[in-house]
């Protein structure tokens, strides 16, 4: 009963987590204009992985997609990749875990097969959660770096006469959604792995039973059965470096580090 509960809860937690990862990936507010200690603007800029938006004081919001692939910063591409990998792994994990649920009977599937599938989905959820957390953390690190860079040269211009106010960006809601969702997926994966141990049939040892016949002494010893499952995962962490790239508009190209993050 505890195993079923653990497996079921792991599935639900992972489902919520993956839904959150999808939501975070689609959200536009990965980075938002920093309003603290800044000139008060009549526009509010915010950016996502796929487009940047501007909300004017009238409430009018205009969003523009990043209509380029090669012109985007390498870091942004890396974050996109991590989030997509997380979603794909999570989706496959969900599919596998549905068939692995103890409460669902599919044909004559043995407990050992369900245990294997539970472990597989659990590992997939763990990797999915780690991908999401890594993606969000890489983006957050990029924001922090750019924030201090733009703070250092908040005002730039020719001889101090003409000033250009640089827009500083801070953490958007999507980052927090991503962190929480990644964490939930990770927890769900761990729960699935724990449930797997309970699902695997344990070794059954029966004591030898002696049957005494009138003339002969016969001992019957039934053989023990053992099911074992073992999955190993070896993931290597790779550092991704920003290749510093130019941005592209729908019609014209404007090189600016603020266009995306």
């Amino acid at each position: 009963m505890a195993v079923t509960a653990c497996q079921g809860l792991g599935f639900v937690v992972s489902l919520i987590g993956i839904a959150g990862i999808i939501a975070a990936t689609c959200m536009d507010q990965w980075s938002t204009q920093d309003l603290y200690n800044n000139p008060v603007t009549a526009v509010f800029n915010y950016q996502g992985l796929w487009r940047s938006c501007v909300r004017e004081s009238s409430g009018f919001t205009e969003c523009r997609g990043y209509f380029t692939l090669l012109g985007l910063p390498a870091m942004l591409q890396a974050v996109r990749a991590l989030m997509i990998v997380g979603i794909v792994l999570g989706a496959i994990g969900l599919l596998v875990s549905i068939f692995a649920l103890k409460c669902i009977r599919i044909g004559s599937m043995e407990d050992s097969a369900k245990a294997n599938m539970t472990l597989t989905s659990g590992i997939m959820f763990i990797v999915s959660g780690l991908c999401a957390i890594a993606g969000v953390s890489v983006f957050a690190n990029m924001l922090v770096t750019n924030f201090w860079m733009s703070t250092a040269n908040m005002y730039t211009g020719m001889g101090g006469m003409v000033q250009t106010v640089q827009t500083r960006y801070t953490f958007g809601a999507a980052l927090f959604v991503g962190w929480v969702a990644g964490g939930l997926t990770l927890i769900g994966g761990v729960m699935m792995c724990i449930a797997c141990r309970g699902l695997a049939p344990e070794e059954t040892n029966y004591k030898a039973v002696s049957y005494h016949a009138s003339g002969h002494s016969v001992a019957y010893k039934p053989g023990g059965f053992k099911a074992s499952t073992g999955f190993g995962s070896n993931t290597k962490n790779k550092k991704i470096y920003d290749g510093g790239a130019r941005t592209e508009d729908e019609v014209q190209s404007y090189p600016s580090k603020h266009d995306y993050v």
Partner: antibody
Framework: DVQLVESGGGSVQPGGSRRLSCAAS????????MHWVRQAPEKGLEWVAY????????YYVDKLKGRFTVSRDNPKNTLFLQMTSLRSEDTAMYYC?????????????WGQGTSITVSS | DIVMTQSPSSLSVSVGEKVTLSCKSS????????????LAWYQQKTGQPPKLLIY???TRESGVPDRFIGSGSGTDFTLTISSVQAEDLAVYFC?????????FGAGTKLELK
């Protein structure tokens, strides 16, 4: 047709108070931010305050903060400007204007204005 | 606060003449988020409220004749009237629409020669 009609103008003594109103019609008032702009006799335009459609945020020109208060009554389609501790330099024509939608924050419709004269 | 400087303060013109009004801002009015300029031009005739002519530095408001052309980016903006008509004689104001407080230029008065 969009219409903005200001009222409440007149002569006020220095240190006195006045409440200006702006009645809006011809558009969904509750969906638009509104501005107050003033113009001293034979002078240029001076932006006074802005109030968003839902009454928050509100922005004022620094020198008038504390003395002037902008508010709105969406069900009555009315914008207000409460002016206190009036000074001679507050003598001007006061216009209410609509913050246009999709016009890069420009003021797309203006009222005819109401005149305030501060003198003893 | 953003300072808007308009030049000239007044201009004497003849009907049919091409006129260029200048407006400079103390800070860039180009929003990097969408690469749009937040500057508006208004026309004010004697005894009337201002009327919006141009927004976003170059977009004409509906109903505004196409002889009014807005241009410029960042800190330098111009309003060009390709062929001045008698009804164009008025004061023209530029306005910063990016930073609060929203500030206006002192205006350029267009007079008949």
């Amino acid at each position: 047709d969009v219409q903005l009609v200001e009222s409440g103008g007149g002569s006020v003594q220095p240190g006195g108070s006045r409440r200006l109103s702006c009645a809006a019609s011809g558009f969904t008032f509750s969906s638009f931010g509104m501005h107050w702009v003033r113009q001293a006799p034979e002078k240029g335009l001076e932006w006074v305050a802005y109030i968003s459609s839902g009454s928050s945020p509100i922005y004022y020109v620094d020198k008038l903060k504390g003395r002037f208060t902008v508010s709105r009554d969406n069900p009555k389609n009315t914008l207000f400007l409460q002016m206190t501790s009036l000074r001679s330099e507050d003598t001007a024509m006061y216009y209410c204007a609509r913050a246009g939608y999709a016009v890069r924050n420009a003021l797309d419709y203006w009222g005819q204005g109401t005149s305030i004269t501060v003198s003893s | 606060d953003i300072v808007m400087t308009q030049s000239p303060s007044s201009l004497s013109v003849s009907v049919g003449e091409k006129v260029t009004l200048s407006c400079k801002s103390s800070q860039s009015l180009l929003n990097l988020g969408n690469q749009k300029n937040y500057l508006a031009w208004y026309q004010q005739k004697t005894g009337q409220p201002p009327k919006l002519l141009i927004y976003g530095a170059s977009t004409r408001e509906s109903g505004v004749p196409d002889r009014f052309i807005g241009s410029g980016s960042g800190t330098d903006f111009t309003l060009t009237i390709s062929s001045v008509q008698a009804e164009d004689l008025a004061v023209y104001f530029c306005q910063n629409d990016l930073f609060y407080p929203l500030t206006f230029g002192a205006g350029t008065k267009l007079e008949l020669k």
